[in-house]
């Protein structure tokens, strides 16, 4: 098995998927409805698996990114890097075990998502096998935002990103050449990644993300869509 | 091929502090999460904590305050400062490499041979 | 603070036999936990990962379940090699936590 440059293994399974290897549609999985004794999921609860959801999906692309290219072992990645105003958790955003402050973490987190979108827009014709699991994530992350603007106290000092800068970003990155196209692919990935893996840490830290029900799998299978708001 | 060695481990006075080290060879430190991990002689294993890609630490209730992890990714090494070490703190210390899927679930799928830190006067 | 409890502690057993050990967390973990594998003097070797999945090179003989908060680690068909001690590990939650590692068990030959 090999594993990539940020210890992903290639064998990695994906919950989301059902057994025909397709994406389960929101609501539609016979594993979720044939479970009455479960208890609604909260906000709180909503908002983990929503997350994981999207990191399987992040997976699923991470495959494909690293199988058609090398970048996932590329040195060359920090220069590339340079060039990519990517989100990123620091110590000052109150996210982290210390110095930990909820609502300028909550503020943080949301912010970030906002100022992703853009780059997941660029993702959405950059897959073959996995276009579909460009657009769930996409789409499964708007959602997720909308989840977490109705957890947060302070929606004021969130900031939007400028849709105009927003297309023209979009305009210059799809006018890379292709090594660089295959590389900001793999940045975005990488990136998302991290940055949703430190605002689970930081909600799961917020207290009230006790109890995630889940199949008799372990799986999370399915998608919180719009309707569920 | 991927190794982890660690080093620094040895006898220490009660009160003392010490410094473990732990080079990596074979991969890049900075992709991955990194954990270290304690065994005290014929005991099981004691987490103590983990330091995340995004530079992130979360301790052990236990290490909070005396314990500190930290990464040099220049020179592909992870340190564990001990301060105030005390007899119960005696135990192999090993680092350990983690690939994490969500938040927290570092599973730890490469581990060091380990060094011993003695906490005796 | 998530507690892990592993029973039994120790479990007396012949090659060939079915060895079953369970792991129980005091919440919730989803199926955030791992299995690993130590043999005395050696370091630890992960086994299985997100409750079920098996890390690389592990024997399929290993097999892991569960969900929530009881798991289980089976052993189809005990192997000489299979003599070691087995611990839990959950990954769901690591602030406000003493140990994310159960207490273990040791597997003995009969």
């Known amino acids: 098995d090999y594993k990539d440059h940020d210890g992903d293994y290639k064998d990695h399974d994906i919950d989301y998927k059902d057994d025909d290897d397709k994406l389960v549609p929101p609501g539609e999985d016979s594993k979720d409805v044939a479970a009455p004794h479960r208890q609604p999921l909260t906000s709180s609860e909503r908002i983990d698996k929503q997350i994981r959801y999207i990191l399987d999906g992040i997976s699923a692309l991470r495959k494909e990114t690293c199988n058609k290219s090398n970048m996932c072992e590329s040195s060359k990645e920090a220069l590339a890097e340079n060039n990519l105003n990517l989100p990123k958790m620091a110590e000052k955003d109150g996210c982290f075990q210390s110095g930990f402050n909820e609502e300028t973490c909550l503020v943080k987190i949301i912010t970030g998502l906002l100022e992703f979108e853009v780059y997941l827009e660029y993702l959405q014709n950059r897959f073959e096998s996995s276009e579909e699991q460009a657009r769930a994530v996409q789409m499964s992350t708007k959602v997720l935002i909308q989840f977490l603007q109705k957890k947060a106290k302070n929606l004021d000092a969130i900031t939007t990103p400028d849709p105009t800068t927003n297309a023209s970003l979009l305009t210059k990155l799809q006018a890379q050449n292709q090594w660089l196209q295959d590389m900001t692919t793999h940045l975005i990935l990488r990136s998302f990644k991290e940055f949703l893996q430190s605002s689970l840490r930081a909600l799961r830290q917020m207290g009230d993300l006790i109890s995630v029900p889940v199949d008799s799998r372990g799986s999370e299978q399915k998608l919180i869509s719009e309707e569920d708001l | 091929e991927v190794q982890l060695v660690e080093s620094g481990g040895g006898l220490v006075q009660p009160g003392g502090s010490l410094r473990l080290s732990c080079t990596v060879s074979g991969i890049d430190l900075s992709s991955y999460d990194m954990s270290w991990v304690r065994q005290a002689p014929g005991k099981g294993l004691e987490w103590v904590g983990y330091?995340?890609?995004?530079?992130?630490?979360y301790y052990a209730n236990w290490a909070k305050g005396r314990f500190t992890i930290s990464r040099d990714n220049s020179k592909n090494t992870l340190y564990l400062q001990m301060n105030s070490l005390r007899a119960e703190d005696t135990a192999v210390y090993y680092c350990?490499?983690?690939?994490?899927?969500?938040?927290?679930?570092?599973?730890?799928?490469?581990w060091g041979q380990g060094t011993l830190v003695t906490v005796s006067s | 603070d998530i507690q892990m409890t592993q029973s039994p502690s120790s479990v007396s057993a012949s090659v060939g036999d079915r060895v079953t050990i369970t792991c129980q967390a005091s919440?919730?973990?989803?199926?955030?936990l791992s299995w690993y594998q130590q043999k005395p003097g050696k370091a630890p070797k992960l086994l299985i990962y997100r409750t079920s999945t098996l890390a690389s090179g592990v024997p399929s003989r290993f097999s892991g379940s569960g969900s929530g908060t009881d798991f289980t680690l089976t052993i189809s068909s005990l192997q000489p090699e299979d003599f070691a001690t087995y611990y839990c590990q959950q990954g769901y939650n690591s602030n406000d936590v003493d140990n994310v590692f159960g207490g273990g068990t040791k597997v003995e030959i009969k």
């Open positions: 919440q919730s973990i989803s199926n955030e």
């Open positions: 350990a490499r983690g690939s994490t899927d969500y938040a927290f679930d570092t599973r730890l799928d490469l």
């Open positions: 330091i995340y890609t995004d530079s992130s630490t």
